[in-house]
Interface confidence: medium
């Protein structure tokens, strides 16, 4: 059944820069990826992108860069300075609407004994929504 | 407000098709996908296949593969669902619905058409 | 594809009582949906992804399970609750819905 994990990691090079990537594990074509912080988006998070396969990138600040890593699986990396940027314990969801089965989001922030460069590998998160 | 509005009744004879509509008000059209379920009298609900409005995806129910076809015009806002080949069994009552899962925002509703008696009968 | 099976097919309550319902998966889900249908309409979704009330619904419904396993609980059963219910999964294609539960009135 459909699951979608999400890696959150903080810059070694840059402290208060930090890269996302969600990815989605499932058979469904893949119609929409939305990335949120501060809870599941439409929830009380702030979208920070939205990846369509077909129309393209839309992205919000503090977002840097979103991108397609594979056909299931993007990345996001957010800039580090200004008062809308990210702390340690910020949550990061992402939100795949995969055609026919639904909207399937998980959330996960930075492991708490993380060092800069260093994260958990990808595991699924757990899902909070399968709409 | 937000409607889906079915075609009127249907009485075919087996081997011939039906073809069922279902126009959509007070919504972005695009912005939803377009499910079919059907019920058999007195039976349970039967998912049918689901239509992406946008990209005019369509996912079938295996039992219907090669049966049916989902349609749409983004124009008039409107889906179609034809079924082929009917026979007896395939006398029920055809609902579309909005599908509740693509949801820009919570909270999630569901909206669903009146119905279409479809009846097969020799 | 994944059979649900609902149980019990009928179920006879008063008013103000507890209902229970339940709906077994063939093989594991991630979620489930709960839908209440009454004579001559259309089905209406109570219940989606397990445990969330969809939009106009009563408090008094909820739901829960993991796995194979789900409920639809109604805390206490108003005279508009004697419906059918049907639980339906999208973990898998083809999506299939349960047989139902008539749930009538003692």
């Known amino acids: 059944t459909p699951e979608v994990w999400v890696q959150v990691r903080m810059e070694a090079t840059e402290l208060s820069s930090f890269t996302i990537r969600c990815g989605f594990l499932g058979s469904g074509s893949i119609s929409l990826v939305t990335v949120s912080w501060g809870g599941p988006n439409g929830a009380g998070g702030t979208t920070l992108a939205v990846l369509h396969p077909e129309r393209g990138i839309r992205q919000w600040a503090p977002a840097r860069q979103a991108r397609w890593e594979t056909q299931s699986s993007i990345s996001l990396i957010l800039e580090g300075s200004g008062a809308s940027s990210p702390c340690a314990n910020t949550t990061f969801c992402c939100k795949f609407a995969s055609f026919p089965e639904g909207s399937w989001e998980a959330c996960g922030s930075l492991p708490p004994s993380s060092d800069p460069g260093l994260s958990a590998p990808p595991t699924p998160a757990p899902i909070l929504r399968a709409d | 407000e937000v409607q889906l509005v079915q075609s009127g009744a249907e009485v075919k004879k087996p081997g011939a098709s039906v073809k069922v509509s279902c126009k959509a008000s007070?919504?972005?059209?695009?912005?939803?996908?377009i499910y079919w379920v059907r019920q058999a009298p007195g039976q349970g609900l039967e998912w049918m296949g689901t239509i992406d409005t946008s990209e005019h995806k369509t996912s079938y129910n295996q039992k219907f593969r090669g049966r049916v076809t989902m349609t749409r015009d983004t124009s008039t806002s409107t889906v179609y669902m034809e079924l082929s080949s009917l026979r007896s069994e395939d006398t029920a009552v055809y609902y579309c619905?909005?599908?509740?899962?693509?949801?820009?925002?919570?909270?999630?509703?569901?909206?669903w058409g009146q119905g279409t008696l479809v009846t097969v009968s020799s | 594809q994944i059979v649900l099976t609902q149980s019990p097919a009928t179920l006879s309550l008063s008013p103000g009582e507890r209902a229970t319902l339940s709906c077994s998966a063939g093989s594991s889900v991630n979620y489930m949906h709960w839908f209440q249908q009454k004579p001559g309409q259309a089905p209406r979704l109570l219940i989606y992804s397990t445990s969330n009330l969809a939009s106009g619904v009563p408090a008094r419904f909820s739901g829960s399970g993991s796995g194979t396993d789900y409920t639809l609980t109604i805390s206490s059963l108003e005279p508009e609750d004697f419906a059918v219910y049907y639980c339906q999964q999208r973990s898998s294609l083809p999506f299939t819905f349960g047989q139902g539960t008539k749930l009538e009135i003692k």
């Open positions: 007070g919504y972005t059209f695009t912005d939803y996908w």
């Open positions: 619905a909005r599908d509740f899962i693509i949801t820009v925002n919570y909270p999630v509703v569901d909206y």
